[in-house]
């Protein structure tokens, strides 16, 4: 059960990150042209 919940949490976090950064992989809160 704990393993299942951990897996569910991990997948949820990954989905959230993917939504945030978008399919292009560029996070609109961070600069990508220089190391700001």
């Amino acid at each position: 059960m704990k393993r299942f919940l951990f897996l569910l949490l991990t997948i949820s976090l990954l989905v959230m990150v993917q939504i945030q950064t978008g399919l292009s992989g560029q996070n609109d809160t961070s600069q990508t042209s220089s190391p700001s």
Epitope: D28, T29, S30, Q31, T32, S33, S34, P35, S36
Partner: antibody, heavy 114, light 111 residues
């Protein structure tokens, strides 16, 4: 939608001063290092100055050709960046863009001529 | 200071044909965080510049997949698989690893 609007350009005599302004919207301005880049037929695109973040103590850096004459500043509360230009020379003539490089505006034109 | 050398300075192409632009930096653009800050910018006639590619190979939003960026260290390439009319203009490579330096530009024009 990202927008960068530069203003303040115009005609100035050699040795004179001018202040350029830029207002940004559509991206988290305070998270971005901001630059002024200029363009002339002679030199193409040329980086002029950069100002970093509050967390970098608003560190500033300049191209050798403008060091001691130009000053870059920012106001995160207004999403604005400025370029104070003193002791202007004919070779400072060009279109000035305020840009994080990720995004670009239309630029403002400075002409230094007598 | 880092110097960016672009070749060729002019590239005459036929619509539908491929195109390739080279950009070489005088020192490595690999930053201490493991990222390489090499961008490609296009300036269409009468317009302001617009970034197409960042971090060597990542396409900005809305950029067609006929554009490909590649390279590492000091040698970089921009390729267009099939040139379209809207691709004409001047292409600049610009490094962001140590302030910013632009290449001289490559004018993509019709043959």
């Amino acid at each position: 939608e990202v927008q960068l609007e530069e203003s303040g350009g115009g005609l100035v005599q050699p040795g004179g001063s001018m202040k350029l302004s830029c207002v940004a919207s559509g991206f988290p301005f305070s998270n971005y290092w901001m630059n002024w880049v200029r363009q002339s037929p002679e030199k193409g695109l040329e980086w002029v100055a950069q100002i970093r973040l509050k967390s970098n103590n608003y560190a500033t850096h300049y191209a050798e050709s403008v060091k001691g004459r130009f000053t870059i500043a920012r106001d995160d509360s207004k999403s604005s960046v400025y370029l104070q230009m003193n002791n202007l020379r004919a070779e400072d003539t060009g279109i000035y863009y305020c840009t994080p490089i990720d995004y670009w505006g239309q630029g403002t034109t400075l002409t230094v001529s007598s | 200071d880092i110097v960016m050398t672009q070749t060729p300075l002019t590239l005459s192409v036929t619509i539908g044909q491929p195109a390739s632009i080279s950009c070489k930096s005088s020192q490595s653009l690999l930053y201490s965080n493991g990222k390489t800050y090499l961008n490609w910018v296009l300036q269409r006639p009468g317009q302001s510049p617009k970034r197409l590619i960042y971090l060597v190979s990542k396409l900005d939003s809305g950029v067609p997949d006929r554009f490909t960026g590649s390279g590492s260290g000091t040698d970089f390439t921009l390729k267009i698989s099939r040139v379209e009319a809207e691709d004409l203009g001047v292409y600049y490579c610009v490094q962001g690893s140590h302030f910013h330096t632009f290449g001289a530009g490559t004018k993509l024009e019709l043959k």
